[in-house]
């Protein structure tokens, strides 16, 4: 009388999260009589996925009338998977009995679940960096499966090359998440500039997942200051003119000061745009001359973004 | 062909012993439990118990515990029920069936029955 | 121990007829219920297994339906042969056991 054999055709199969799975068994012989279980893992801990005998398993469907008297194919569909699922499932052939006795298992077949990443999301710094200085962007996605991924950096679609990548864990897992911190150098002209993350999986099929930030939230671009005076008017005022120019964000305060004290202040907003993302503001001050014995020293006073106040002075010469 | 052949009828007195054997053919025998089933006359069916020859299990109805016995002899393909300490109330057709069920249990292969008479 | 409860006891029928016996099971058993036919003088014959598979060649007019605790056997156009006692079986957990039979006799 030939041996009863448990026989699992696939050692590995690989399905989407969401599609069902099929995990084939058959058995050579209907002898000895006694049920199937479908188990994951092996040992003392092993998960029971489904009995032939009882139980309610409402993901799992065997493929054949487990009540027919003649039936050797155990194969069994589990739908929705998720990668939960992931593991090896052995199909084990049991002989009746009180208990029933544990007499073959098939060699096992290992589900992976192929699982897409979630969209990347980049974070930038908490505060903001002026040019020439270095900012860290970081770049997050989780829960693929399998582990293989790949992740580039691009700023204004030229690919960078300082950045440092992890995946996480570093053993097996039914899903993965992978972290990755790129270095950027600011120039004045990033105001417009983009760092994009784009991941590349299995899952995706040639189609990475890209993730984007906005350098305009990383950046601070100083204010050039200029202080210049116009020709004296026939009433013996002098227009003194500050201009701001090139700076980003627009949050400014301009503060102008005769001899010390503060004369008006104001504040920037709704400025036109330069083509660079960059912002100039134009403030003029009319001195009454003949108002003075002596030369007034005139300051413009402008405080950006919370920076420490950055002051321009000039002179208007008063005639004996 | 497929057949469960059985011994023949006895009568035994209350007290005594019984043996019934039950004679497969035409099958793998090792390959399915056998059950014994008896039927008092103008009674129902009663089920006393269960073997598997392929790893000598056994299951007895509780209330024949101690008093049954069920072996096999794998060389002949013959199963055996031993019924000890007879009463009258004993007096019965015994009957083996092939259990047939993968997952659940169940009876596709019948004996003719022995009858067994207890009376003093 | 499951205890198996069958009715009617008996039933009085024409042929032609369809009959319908049921068996319910003090506690659940999935689809492990069997249906016996005997008659006087011989062994009982298994006419379905699994609550609803019709054992090799049984006739077609025999049925059986139900899971849980709920089942019927449904004979579709009684014949003189059917005249016997019918018995329904668990088959999920030892102890088996059967039901106390529904005598099926000629009106």
């Known amino acids: 009388e030939e041996e009863l054999q448990v026989i699992q055709p696939e050692k590995s199969v690989s399905v989407a999260a969401g599609e069902s799975a099929t995990l084939n068994c058959t058995a050579t012989s209907l002898i000895p009589v006694g049920p199937i279980q479908w188990f994951r893992g092996v040992g003392p801990g092993r998960e029971l996925i489904y009995s032939q005998k009882e139980g309610h398993f409402p993901r799992v469907t065997p493929v054949s009338d487990p009540t027919k008297r003649n039936n050797m194919d155990f194969s069994i569909r589990i739908s929705n998977i998720t990668p939960a699922d992931a593991g090896t499932y052995y199909c084990v052939k049991f002989r009746k009995g009180s208990p029933d006795v544990e007499l073959k298992s098939g060699a096992g077949t290992e589900l992976s679940v192929r699982a897409k990443p979630s969209a990347p999301v980049v974070s930038g710094p908490a505060v903001r960096a002026t040019a020439e200085h270095t900012v860290s962007f970081t770049c997050e996605s989780h829960g693929f499966s399998p582990r293989d991924i790949t992740l580039k950096w691009f700023k204004n679609g030229n690919e960078l090359s300082d950045f440092q990548t992890n995946v996480d864990p570093a053993g097996k897992s039914v899903s993965y998440s992978i972290r990755s911190t790129a270095r950027v150098v600011l120039t004045r002209r990033d105001v417009h500039s983009q760092v994009i993350c784009e991941v590349a999986h299995v899952t995706l099929q040639g189609d990475p997942l890209r993730g984007t930030a906005n350098l305009s939230e990383a950046i601070r671009v100083p204010p050039f200051l200029e202080v210049t005076q116009q020709s004296m008017r026939a009433d013996n005022q002098v227009n003194v003119t500050c201009q701001v120019t090139k700076f980003y964000p627009q949050r400014l305060q301009l503060t102008w000061l005769e001899n010390g004290n503060v004369s008006r202040t104001e504040m920037a907003s709704a400025l036109p745009e330069n083509k660079d993302g960059t912002y100039n503001w134009t403030s003029w001050l009319l001195v009454n001359v003949s108002a003075h014995r002596d030369d007034v020293k005139l300051t413009c006073q402008v405080e950006h973004d919370g920076q420490p106040a950055v002051n321009k002075s000039f002179s208007v010469k008063v005639s004996a | 062909q497929v057949q469960l052949v059985q011994s023949g009828a006895e009568v035994k007195k209350p007290g005594a012993s019984v043996k019934v054997s039950c004679k497969a053919s035409g099958y793998t025998f090792t390959g399915y439990p056998i059950s014994w089933v008896r039927q008092a006359p103008g009674q129902g069916l009663e089920w006393m118990g269960w073997?598997?020859?392929?790893?000598?299990?056994?299951n007895y109805a509780q209330k024949l515990q101690g008093r049954v016995t069920m072996t096999t002899d794998t060389s002949t393909s013959t199963a055996y029920m031993e019924l000890r300490s007879l009463r009258s109330d004993d007096t019965a057709v015994y009957y083996c069936?092939?259990?047939?069920?993968?997952?659940?249990?169940?009876?596709?292969?019948w004996g003719r029955g022995t009858l067994v008479t207890v009376s003093s | 121990d499951i205890q198996m409860t069958q009715s009617p006891s008996s039933v009085s029928a024409s042929v032609g007829d369809r009959v319908t016996i049921t068996c319910r099971a003090s506690q659940g058993i999935s689809s492990w219920l069997a249906w016996y036919q005997q008659k006087p003088g011989k062994a009982p014959k298994l006419l379905i297994y699994?609550?609803?598979n019709l054992q090799s060649g049984v006739p077609s007019r025999f049925s059986g339906s139900g899971s849980g605790t709920d089942f019927t056997l449904t004979i579709s156009s009684l014949q003189p042969e059917d005249f016997a006692t019918y018995y329904c079986?668990?088959?999920?957990?030892?102890?088996?056991?059967f039901g106390g039979g529904t005598k099926v006799e000629i009106k």
């Open positions: 073997i598997y020859a392929y790893g000598g299990n056994t």
């Open positions: 079986q668990q088959g999920a957990s030892f102890p088996i056991t």
């Open positions: 699994a609550a609803s």
């Open positions: 069936a092939r259990e047939a069920g993968s997952s659940w249990y169940d009876f596709d292969l």
